[in-house]
């Protein structure tokens, strides 16, 4: 009996036309939502004038439906048993699941000012930038609507910066009508233990953002894993959002709509400094902000963001070192709300429920030559927003799963 089930599972999890896996893989049957909480700065003047702690108040959730578009350019390669695809991006605002509208205003760090002052360190260029910042009436902080902050706005300061520069700024700009990839993943036809594992991303096996093993593209995209998942496994996956591969470890057994699943979580060790977790040495890319690689819980992804000083962390600086959150008031990290988990059905390896949580931060540094940054006495890793991307198998799909998969085994 068990052998027959194994054979059936192996057949059905292959990523090719006609299998259960393929149908759900091309276009997810799960509704996926991305909730945003924006960190509204309460004391912009005090920070700019006196280098005070930044007082933030989170506002949210503002919810978007995401991942509703089918994969594009799906191409099987029979020679190397892979399937390649693009994952199109799309976001639809869900007013009924949100605390306000996309027109709500927030006081946030001026993204362009922080980025330009970081990218251009030369003092004479900084004098020019200062002139343009003042001329455009820009400051260290700005008021922007949710729509502008997420999806893009024309920045008045950047509009004065001479060619060639993108004058549109947004944390997720450009998003709609773009696609992530090309991904090329193993379809599992020849070896089921490799199904969904990424072979190449954008035509390469490495990212070119990190040194050594940190640069590798490991595992799947976390939507599914090879079947027959064991609790002892370390599940590797790649996330283009954070420009790196990461891993999850087993935490607990969970019952999801009558389906037994394994809850895998991203452990604090994954965010540790190289002092505590030597494997992370290659995620430490500079010595000053990281205090000689002793800081932890923030990931400098500037190399992946055209030099813009973007730092990724867990929400509210969960699992981050005290020095990171010390200049920010109003944060309350807790594991339950702010960690990332994947609920995986172990027989098929399908992720039936997940919560992916991350925070986008921007580094801002003092600058002698830029008036609006002149009074700063320290570096700040400024939280801009955090997001919670969630998906849960629907009731109908869960019934089907119970009857066709778990029911048969039990």
């Amino acid at each position: 009996g068990d052998l027959l089930i194994q054979k059936t599972i192996k057949k059905q999890v292959v990523l090719e036309e006609g299998t259960i896996a393929f149908k759900n893989w091309v276009k997810t049957g799960t509704e996926v939502y991305r909730q945003f909480w924006i960190f509204d700065v309460q004391n912009p003047q005090e920070v700019m004038m006196n280098s005070s702690n930044i007082q933030v108040k989170q506002r949210g959730p503002y919810t978007y439906r995401v991942r509703f578009l089918a994969k594009e350019n799906v191409t099987q390669d029979a020679e190397d048993n892979t399937v390649s695809f693009l994952q199109p991006n799309g976001a639809i605002f869900e007013p009924s699941l949100s605390v306000g509208t996309e027109a709500d205003n927030f006081t946030v760090l001026n993204l362009a000012v922080a980025a330009a002052s970081h990218i251009y360190q030369n003092q004479f260029v900084q004098m020019i930038l200062n002139s343009l910042i003042n001329k455009s009436k820009s400051s260290m902080f700005q008021v922007r609507t949710l729509r502008e902050l997420l999806w893009g706005y024309r920045d008045p300061f950047l509009s004065l910066v001479p060619y060639p520069v993108t004058t549109t700024v947004g944390l997720f700009y450009p998003y709609n009508n773009t696609a992530d990839g090309v991904y090329k993943v193993f379809n599992g036809k020849d070896n089921i233990s490799k199904v969904a594992i990424i072979d190449t991303y954008k035509g390469k096996r490495n990212l070119s953002y990190w040194e050594s093993h940190c640069d590798m593209i490991n595992g799947t995209d976390a939507a599914s894993f090879p079947p027959f998942v064991e609790k002892s496994q370390v599940l590797q996956f790649f996330s283009s959002d954070i420009c790196r591969s990461i891993y999850a470890v087993f935490e607990s057994d969970v019952n999801l709509k009558g389906i037994p699943v394994y809850r895998f979580v991203l452990p604090s060790k994954a965010f540790a400094s190289p002092v505590e977790n030597p494997d992370n040495y290659c995620f430490c890319t500079e010595k000053i902000i990281s205090k000689n690689c002793t800081s932890y819980g923030v990931l400098d992804i500037s190399k992946c963001k055209e030099g813009r000083p973007v730092y990724i962390s867990l929400p509210h600086f969960l699992y981050a070192s005290p020095d990171v959150s010390e200049p920010i008031d109003g944060l309350n990290p807790n594991e339950e709300e702010h960690r990332t988990y994947l609920d995986i059905e172990p027989i098929t390896g399908f992720t039936l429920q997940f919560a992916k949580r991350l925070q986008v931060n921007l580094l801002v540094k003092p600058s002698e030559k830029i008036q609006v940054l002149k009074n700063l006495k320290r570096n700040y890793i400024v939280p801009i927003l955090w997001l919670n991307e969630t998906g849960t198998i629907g009731d109908e799909k869960a019934n089907m799963f119970r009857s066709q998969v778990t029911g048969k085994i039990n």
Epitope: Y120, N122, V125, L132, K135, V161, P162, Y163, P164
Partner: nanobody, 118 residues
Framework: QVQLQESGGGLVQPGGSLRLSCAAS????????MSWYRQAPGKERELVAL????????DYADSVKGRFTISRDDAEKTVSLQMNSLKPEDTAVYYC???????????WGQGTQVTVSS
């Protein structure tokens, strides 16, 4: 090979005028912000005037506002600084500079001496 060549410096009495000119070659001139900096003996180099590329937005150091005027001629690849009501404290070496977002530091000219003295 990018070259910026300043001219028009000299000795002038307080209250007098001078027009500095900077001729550029080897660069797509119209895509650059052009600036004039100056450096007085024993002092830091400071930004005096700036003109952006498209639209030609201008900006000036507070100390020269209302007295100096920067202009550009993209066809001739020149940038000029008209200096009126000159004061002794305007005495310095004046440098022409070109910068755009692809550069981490500006291009510089050799400088031209301006002396305001009676």
């Amino acid at each position: 090979q990018v070259q910026l060549q300043e001219s028009g410096g000299g000795l002038v009495q307080p209250g007098g005028s001078l027009r500095l000119s900077c001729a550029a070659s080897g660069l797509a001139f119209s895509t650059y912000a052009m600036s004039w900096y100056r450096q007085a003996p024993g002092k830091e180099r400071e930004l005096v005037a700036l003109i952006t590329s498209a639209g030609g937005t201008t900006d000036y150091a507070d100390s020269v506002k209302g007295r100096f005027t920067i202009s550009r001629d993209d066809a001739e690849k020149t940038v000029s600084l008209q200096m009126n009501s000159l004061k002794p404290e305007d005495t310095a070496v004046y440098y022409c500079s070109a910068w755009r977002a692809t550069l981490f530091k500006p291009y510089w000219g050799q400088g031209t001496q301006v002396t305001v003295s009676s």
